[in-house]
């Protein structure tokens, strides 16, 4: 059964000996507590109690789920890949059924020669994997195939990928103009049919960082960003110091809640802060402000 | 892979003949194959070829006194060298294409499947 829990407040106490008198749980959210047994964990927000204590799920932490993290880890994949579905059509190479079936030695052979071909067309192309015949049919041997392409994940990949795909079209278009039979002769390791070429598809890997940060950061999802360094996406919060987007609480603590990234101020021995930065000072003795 | 093996190489007088053979391990009925060779120094030549269909050409070098021919049955190539000339020392090696290859009738084909060679020595 789930129970719902008062909201209490917490006095924190900063570095300085100061404290901050915070509501643990924002006034709106509505809280839910996992009770196990004879144990009432207080796991808050989905979090639920393993015996020793709660495990949080994402964006929360604490020892009752109840705080939200200031980063997310969002992982891109380490290489992103395209797959072009290409049609050539091969003159020299006279066409049997025995070309159908993957086992035969027909098909063994065309496939050698084929990839190696291929891998001096695109040997200029360092996101060039290589080549997979996905089906030969008649006419002469029209090649059914896919291009596969690779590289490292940057923000850029999509660039790189769709430029890759370019320099594949002018390639396979080059050398099907130029590797044509002439007087029923062919010198090269393969001859083609000009106007058998073709690009059907090309399907690129679709990562979207943003998009993946906001899903983990669920219903904060308004209030968590990405910023980049060294080219590796970062999921955070305001809260989080040391990006763009970092708030500055001076002399204060961020805390996140569903409204968005706020500040609590500190009180010192010496000083009331105030503001939405906490960055004005109030003297307790003299009352006036310190800007 | 077809493995290509060439033999019948050795050494010979000016005038003389030698039959070189190549044997394959695989089915060269529709095959295109043909014989290179490659002196010392020099790079490698196309000296004889036969197409799929049985057509045969040769290096103008070696017109008139080369024959090329190929035994299906055994699946084995030949290269009849007759009136040897130093100029035709050299290693020769066989080589063929992919089955049901067709348009290869010229000695500058590329194939892919080259076999070791055999050396031939003709002294004067």
């Known amino acids: 059964p789930l129970a719902t829990i008062p909201v209490s407040t917490t006095s924190l106490t900063s570095s300085e000996g100061s404290t901050i008198s915070t509501p643990s749980v924002d006034i709106s959210t509505p809280v839910t507590t996992s009770i196990v047994g004879d144990q009432c964990s207080r796991c808050k927000n989905g979090g639920f109690w393993d015996g020793l204590k709660c495990q949080c799920l994402t964006p929360y932490y604490g020892e009752s789920c109840e705080e939200v993290v200031n980063s997310i880890d969002i992982a891109p994949p380490e290489t992103v890949s395209a797959q072009m579905e290409l049609t050539v059509t091969v003159t020299s190479v006279k066409f049997t059924d025995e070309l159908k079936n993957h086992s035969s030695q027909e098909f063994r052979e065309f496939n050698k020669t084929f990839t190696e071909q291929m891998n001096i067309v695109y040997s200029g192309i360092p996101e060039y994997v290589g080549v997979n015949i996905t089906n030969l049919r008649l006419g002469s041997v029209v090649v059914e195939h896919d291009v596969l392409l690779r590289t490292k994940y940057t923000p850029e990949y999509k660039t790189a990928l769709d430029n890759a795909t370019e320099v594949v079209k002018q390639k396979i278009t080059k050398v099907t103009t130029e590797q044509i039979m002439t007087n029923d002769n062919c010198s090269a390791l393969m001859c083609f049919n000009t106007t058998g070429t073709q690009v059907q598809n090309i399907t690129v890997t679709q990562y979207d960082p943003v998009e993946e940060c906001r899903q983990k950061a669920e219903e904060y999802e308004d209030y968590f960003l990405v910023e980049y360094r060294d080219q590796k996406p970062y999921c955070i919060s305001p809260c989080e110091s040391g990006f763009n987007a970092s708030k500055n609480c001076n002399h204060g603590k961020c805390q996140m809640s569903q409204n968005g990234a706020r500040c609590l101020c500190v009180t010192t021995e010496t000083h009331w802060y105030s503001g939405e930065d906490c960055n004005q000072g109030t003297q307790k003795s003299h009352h006036h402000h310190h800007h | 892979d077809v493995q290509l093996q060439a033999s019948g190489g050795g050494a010979v007088q000016a005038g003389g003949s030698l039959r070189l053979s190549c044997a394959a391990s695989?089915?060269?009925?529709?095959?295109?194959m043909g014989w290179f060779r490659q002196a010392p120094g020099k790079e490698r030549e196309g000296v004889a070829g036969?197409?799929?269909?049985?057509?045969?050409i040769y290096a103008d070098s070696v017109k008139g006194r080369f024959t090329i021919s190929k035994d299906n049955a055994k699946n084995s190539l030949y290269l009849q060298m007759n009136s040897l000339a130093p100029e035709d020392t050299a290693n020769y090696s066989c080589?063929?294409?992919?089955?049901?290859?067709?348009?290869?009738?010229?000695?500058?084909?590329?194939?892919?499947?080259r076999g070791q060679g055999t050396q031939v020595t003709v002294s004067s």
């Open positions: 080589a063929a294409s992919i089955l049901n290859r067709v348009g290869c009738r010229q000695l500058s084909y590329e194939y892919i499947y």
């Open positions: 695989g089915d060269i009925t529709r095959r295109c």
């Open positions: 036969i197409s799929e269909d049985g057509i045969t």
